[in-house]
Interface confidence: medium
């Protein structure tokens, strides 16, 4: 469809509330340091302008693209260069280069303090102005996560408001709010990581990589739907995510709503698990579809070998319609294996493709590809064994101990990576234990590998900004589906020159005593990384002793009447002790 005014079209489709929310998210994701009030002003101006275009689509500037309108708004900010430096250089470019330039300046690791929920203050804000409260939530999440899936953030904002509607009435606001906010926070962080991986796959590996990922995922989830149906959804979904990752949030949200409508209208041929999703309002409906339970497998599935090994026309199919044939293979294999991770399914499809590429050029192709399915077993065994070993380690050490084991493992593999990044990534990798190891056997593999893909993508995104390790660059860029096996296969870096011992790194203060448990752990784990960077060959026994002594030292000083005085006296002794143990 062609519209005289794109902004009027989107305003009418989305309605004022969602339109304003999405515009706020868009500006917050680009200008991550601007105060909320500045963004509200921009949103108000854009909304007023959109309304004039709705009233008269041929009014001045209404025919401009949304990129042009948004870009012009950003570039009109007087303090742009002062606060954002070279982002202002983007304003010298023309569209579409200007928008590309803005996207490249999004910061995945902005220097914004962690949000600490204060139930009393938050309830006061909520009761004073619900609309502002909703907007502030969108702003705070969007600026910290510049690739957050915008329509999904609107959904989480509704859930957030609902939590406050319920808990601000409660006698004990904190007891009601804090666990609910924490639960929502975990969901939001997972959602951010999932979307960041989708955007990375589109931006770094192309649309075809994202389509292959989606095809496998949707085939697992909707095994009753046939290939044509899945392919249509994959194509539409790729468009939605391409738009959101590209900053076209209004178009993305509009197209996502259309896709949800299509899925619900055709649920009879897609999945039996969508009924209750389709009765919900728009944002809940889209979220529910995305999270839908796997449908049961059709009873009458034929053995895969018939079509992909025994059929004499395999090479004809492969040569004459390569992408569709491989797509069909991935669809058929995925729907039969809900227990496999998406990455594993894509690795299997890659091996199948490589085998046909090789065999179809030979004298006797059927004899050559006859055993292709046997090649898949090692691909399946590798992650299964790895998960088994790591889950055993997790059971033995507990979450904190398991995180420390991963800190040691990864610091030895890639010691060049910054300490905060190593701590963040290893801590998140360590969470795979509590997330997946308790799951039933048939869910463990997909749970673990798909989660690890999210965490390793975070490492890749952070490393790309300041590359320091060729090994990390290689694992991140060579193959999306082989990232996890690539990192797993890395061995300790024997070429690394140890860091000098800096006493300041191991100087602690009284604030350590009042920190929440997770922040205390981060301090200790930061010290552990620095220790390993100084002594990469430290033994497990040495590290265990140092960590034990550190815990005793902190406990002693936090129990002392004057914390700071204790740290000042005991700290230097602790440093001497460390050096002695590691000598």
């Amino acid at each position: 469809d062609t519209y005289k005014s794109e902004i009027a079209h989107r305003f009418k489709d989305l309605g004022e509330q969602y339109f304003k929310g999405l515009v706020l998210i868009a500006f917050s994701q680009h200008l991550q340091q601007c105060p909320y009030e500045e963004h509200v002003k921009l949103v108000r101006e854009v909304t007023e302008f959109a309304k004039t275009c709705v009233a008269d689509e041929s009014a001045e500037n209404c025919d401009k693209s949304i990129h042009t309108l948004f870009g012009d708004k950003l570039c009109a900010i007087p303090s742009l260069r002062e606060h954002y430096g070279d982002l202002a250089d983007c304003c010298e470019k023309e569209e579409p280069e200007r928008n590309e330039c803005f996207l490249q300046h999004k910061n995945d690791n902005p220097d914004i303090p962690k949000l600490k929920p204060d139930p009393v203050a938050l309830c006061a804000d909520f009761q004073e102005d619900e609309q502002k409260f909703w907007g502030k939530y969108l702003y705070e999440i969007a600026r910290r996560h510049p690739y957050f899936y915008a329509p999904e953030l609107l959904y989480y904002a509704i859930i957030y408001k609902d939590v406050f509607s319920e808990c601000c009435q409660a006698a004990d606001k904190a007891a009601c709010l804090l666990p609910k906010i924490e639960h929502l926070r975990e969901k939001v962080l997972t959602s951010a990581a999932k979307q960041r991986l989708k955007c990375a796959s589109i931006q770094k590996f192309g649309e075809r990589a994202f389509k292959a990922w989606s095809l496998a995922r949707l085939s697992q989830r909707f095994p009753k739907a046939d290939f044509t149906e899945i392919s249509k959804i994959v194509t539409d979904l790729a468009k939605v995510h391409k738009e959101c990752c590209h900053g076209d949030l209004l178009e993305c949200a509009d197209d996502r709503a259309d896709l949800a409508k299509y899925i619900c209208e055709n649920q009879d041929t897609i999945s039996t698990k969508l009924k209750e999703c389709c009765d919900k309002p728009l944002l809940e409906k889209s979220h529910c579809i995305a999270e839908a339970k796997r449908d049961e497998l059709p009873a009458d599935l034929n053995p895969l070998e018939h079509d992909f090994v025994e059929d004499k026309e395999v090479c004809k199919n492969y040569k004459e319609a390569k992408h569709v044939f491989l797509g069909t293979f991935l669809y058929e294999y995925s729907r039969r294996h809900p227990d496999y991770s998406v990455s594993l399914l894509l690795r299997i499809a890659k091996i199948y493709e490589a085998t046909l590429e090789d065999c179809c050029a030979k004298e006797d192709p059927p004899a050559c590809y006859a055993t292709v399915f046997d090649k898949f077993q090692p691909l399946v065994d590798e992650p299964k064994n790895l998960i088994k070993q790591n889950c055993e380690l997790f059971e033995k050490l507990g979450e904190y101990g398991f995180q420390n084991a991963l800190i040691v493992r990864y610091t030895k593999k890639v010691p060049q990576v910054s300490t905060p990044t190593l701590v963040e990534v290893a801590r998140k990798l360590g969470l795979v234990g509590s997330r997946c190891c308790k799951r039933p056997e048939e869910e463990r593999l997909s749970c673990a590998e798909d989660y690890l893909s999210l965490v390793l993508n975070r490492l890749c995104v952070l490393h790309e900004k300041t590359p320091v390790s060729e090994k990390v660059t290689k694992c991140c860029t060579e193959s999306l589906v082989n990232r996890r096996p690539c990192f797993s296969a890395l061995t300790p870096d024997e070429t690394y020159k140890p860091k000098e011992f800096v006493e300041g790194t191991f100087t602690f203060h009284a604030d350590l005593c009042t920190l929440p448990e997770d922040e205390k752990q981060i301090k200790k784990q930061t010290a552990l990384v620095e220790l390993l960077k100084h002594k990469p060959h430290a033994t497990e026994e040495q590290l265990r002793t140092v960590l034990g002594n550190f815990a005793a030292f902190v406990q002693k000083c936090c129990a002392a009447p004057d914390h700071e005085a204790c740290f000042a006296v005991e700290g230097p002794k602790f440093v001497i002790e460390i050096r002695g143990i590691l000598a």
Epitope: D226, F227, T228, S231, D300, N302, H306, D307, D311, K312, E313, K316, N317, E320, A321, V324, F325, T328, Y331, E332
Partner: nanobody, 126 residues
């Protein structure tokens, strides 16, 4: 559900031609792999020709290559089999079959097709 209805069979002299049609309903014909099979009296059902779904890849049994042509008209949702240079050994009931699960893949194995027409008789005799 896919319903298939064949037509166009009849009596023809050796060397003559016939065009069979198969009208489909309940599914777009270009979204599903479709094929023609035949069964002569006292014999097994055998693959004659097939066409992939979503991609126009055609497949033929060796015995009909160069004589028969499979095609489809998406606007009419109909599959065709143009049969030229007919021989007495082509005498059989001709069935149209559809396999919507995976478009593209046209198998020569009859058991892999869940949907069948009722068949149309072709007799080649002088």
């Amino acid at each position: 559900e896919v319903q298939l209805l064949e037509s166009g069979g009849g009596l023809v002299q050796p060397g003559g031609s016939l065009r069979l049609s198969c009208a489909a309903s309940g599914r777009y014909i270009d979204e599903t792999a479709v094929a023609w099979f035949r069964q002569a009296p006292g014999k097994e059902r055998e693959f004659v020709a097939g066409i992939g779904g979503g991609v126009d890849i055609t497949y033929y049994a060796d015995s009909v290559k160069g004589r028969f042509t499979i095609s489809r008209d998406n606007s009419k949702n109909t599959l065709y089999l143009q049969m030229n240079s007919l021989r007495p050994e082509d005498t059989a009931v001709y069935y149209c079959a559809a396999r919507p699960g995976s478009p593209l893949i046209t198998s020569k194995v009859a058991d892999l097709y869940p949907y069948w027409g009722q068949g149309t008789l072709v007799t080649v005799s002088s």
